[in-house]
């Protein structure tokens, strides 16, 4: 049994780091493998993650962490029984993938303005809470070419757009994702999308 693709890990900078790797053949990850992780710090103990299958030869492990600070560094040991298959390390602050925003809502009752709001996925005491910026993706269900991205570079988890920038009388979907420049993170996954019917009063044409 050998590791074909070494574990790579990302942290949500809150409570979970996710490591993925591939074995050289079909593997029952949860019965054959264990990923041990230990904070490199005084009096810390090793903790065990039981991996799950992620495709035939792929494994994924969700490492539970109490919290994360920038200095944290973990040793990782991948075991198959008594055999050490791989040894490495992981610094969560250097591999951050934020949590996806939630509760995306489209408010259509504000005159001819669309107000999109969502929730910051972090609690106020988490460092990322005040450092997230967002990208909002809006697209038409009827017209694949009608696809747009709005970058929200302020901290407020909301976006206002004129309803008239979208076509009237058709359905649109929106989703939002987050990233944090401070830790040069990757983008989060997209939030679940939300759907609404776009309709607004066309202004009277004056001749």
């Amino acid at each position: 049994m050998k590791v074909l693709q070494e574990p790579t890990c990302v942290s949500d900078y809150m409570s979970i780091s996710t490591c993925e790797w591939k074995m050289n053949g079909p593997t029952n990850c949860s019965t054959e493998l264990r990923l041990l992780y230990q904070l490199v710090f005084l009096l810390s103990e090793a903790h065990t993650c039981i991996p799950e299958n992620n495709g035939g030869a792929g494994c994924v492990c969700h490492l539970l962490m109490d919290d994360v600070v920038s200095a944290d560094n973990y040793t990782l040991d991948l075991w198959a029984g008594q055999q050490l298959l791989w040894k490495g390390s992981f610094k969560p602050s250097e591999h951050v993938k934020p949590r996806a925003p939630g509760n995306l809502t489209v408010h259509t009752n504000v005159s001819d303005t669309l107000l999109l709001t969502w929730s910051n996925p972090y609690p106020p005491d988490n460092y990322l809470y005040n450092h997230l910026t967002y990208a909002v993706n809006i697209w038409s269900e009827n017209d694949p070419a009608d696809f747009r991205i709005y970058n929200v570079t302020y901290l407020e988890p909301s976006l206002r757009i004129a309803a008239s920038t979208l076509k009237s009388g058709i359905s649109y979907r929106a989703r939002v994702r987050a990233w944090a420049q401070c830790y040069n993170t990757t983008w989060s996954e997209w939030s679940p999308s939300t759907k609404w019917h776009n309709s607004y009063r066309e202004p009277f044409e004056q001749h």
């Epitope: 904070l39 009096l43 600070v69 920038s70």
Partner: antibody, heavy 125, light 112 residues
Framework: EVQLVESGGGLEQPGGSLRLSCAGS????????MTWVRQAPGKGLEWVSS????????YYADSVKGRFTISRDNSKNTLYLQMNSLRAEDTAVYYC??????????????????WGQGTTVTVSS | DIVMTQSPLSLPVTPGEPASISCRSS???????????LDWYLQKSGQSPQLLIY???NRASGVPDRFSGSGSGTDFTLKISRVEAEDVGFYYC?????????FGQGTKLEIK
């Protein structure tokens, strides 16, 4: 009530051995690291040794390394300090103290928040 | 090893007056944001040490609010806003960032 009670101190000749014990109660003993600190007569406090909750990790002061062994029996909620090759400079009151919570991924530290009453070790011929 | 230096070593105080003890470390005790591994302990005559402050500024359970800790990195301070007779004893700072854990020499607080 969270409590630590030391025992095992006494008078011993140079080169001799003693085993100190520290019985914990009122907290989940196995979840916490434990530490020994000593105080020579009329002197300040000196750290001696520490051990993680499972006993897998131990640390020693240079002055006792190779002579003292820290261990624990979590089934008995007891911490030990085996002291061999005793020297006159080991004469002190020995305290055990409850250290950080090591059952968590990040050891949670709230100081050495509980101390035993101390046990006196005298090394003299 | 990290060397801890306390000052003053002797501190005569009038009851009701404030008192301040300084502690300096030879290396930074800041592990990461919000984690300075510096404690303060009080040892009264004939007793075991008791924890006053942990992680530089957190008051231990049951410690009166006249005791406060501050500082970060290498410079730390213990303040007593109004000294009471029961506060006499030796005050020690201690670092637990790295082994060996090291203590300051101790400050003897006495009532004038």
């Amino acid at each position: 009530e969270v409590q630590l009670v030391e025992s095992g101190g006494g008078l011993e000749q140079p080169g001799g051995s003693l085993r100190l014990s520290c019985a914990g109660s009122g907290f989940t003993f196995r979840d916490y690291a434990m530490t020994w600190v000593r105080q020579a007569p009329g002197k300040g406090l000196e750290w001696v040794s520490s051990i993680s909750g499972s006993g897998s990790t131990t640390y020693y002061a240079d002055s006792v390394k190779g002579r003292f062994t820290i261990s624990r029996d979590n089934s008995k909620n007891t911490l030990y300090l085996q002291m061999n090759s005793l020297r006159a400079e080991d004469t002190a009151v020995y305290y055990c103290a409850k250290d950080r919570l090591t059952a968590s991924v990040r050891p949670i530290y709230v100081g050495l928040d509980v101390w035993g009453q101390g046990t006196t070790v005298t090394v003299s011929s | 090893d990290i060397v801890m230096t306390q000052s003053p070593l002797s501190l005569p105080v009038t009851p009701g007056e404030p008192a301040s003890i300084s502690c300096r470390s030879s290396q930074s005790l800041l592990y990461s944001e919000g984690y300075n591994y510096l404690d303060w302990y009080l040892q009264k005559s004939g007793q075991s040490p008791q924890l006053l402050i942990y992680l530089a500024s957190n008051r231990a359970s049951g410690v009166p609010d006249r005791f406060s800790g501050s500082g970060s990195g290498t410079d730390f301070t213990l303040k007593i806003s109004r000294v009471e007779a029961e506060d006499v004893g030796f005050y020690y700072c201690m670092q637990t960032l790295k082994t060996p854990y090291t203590f300051g020499q101790g400050t003897k607080l006495e009532i004038k």
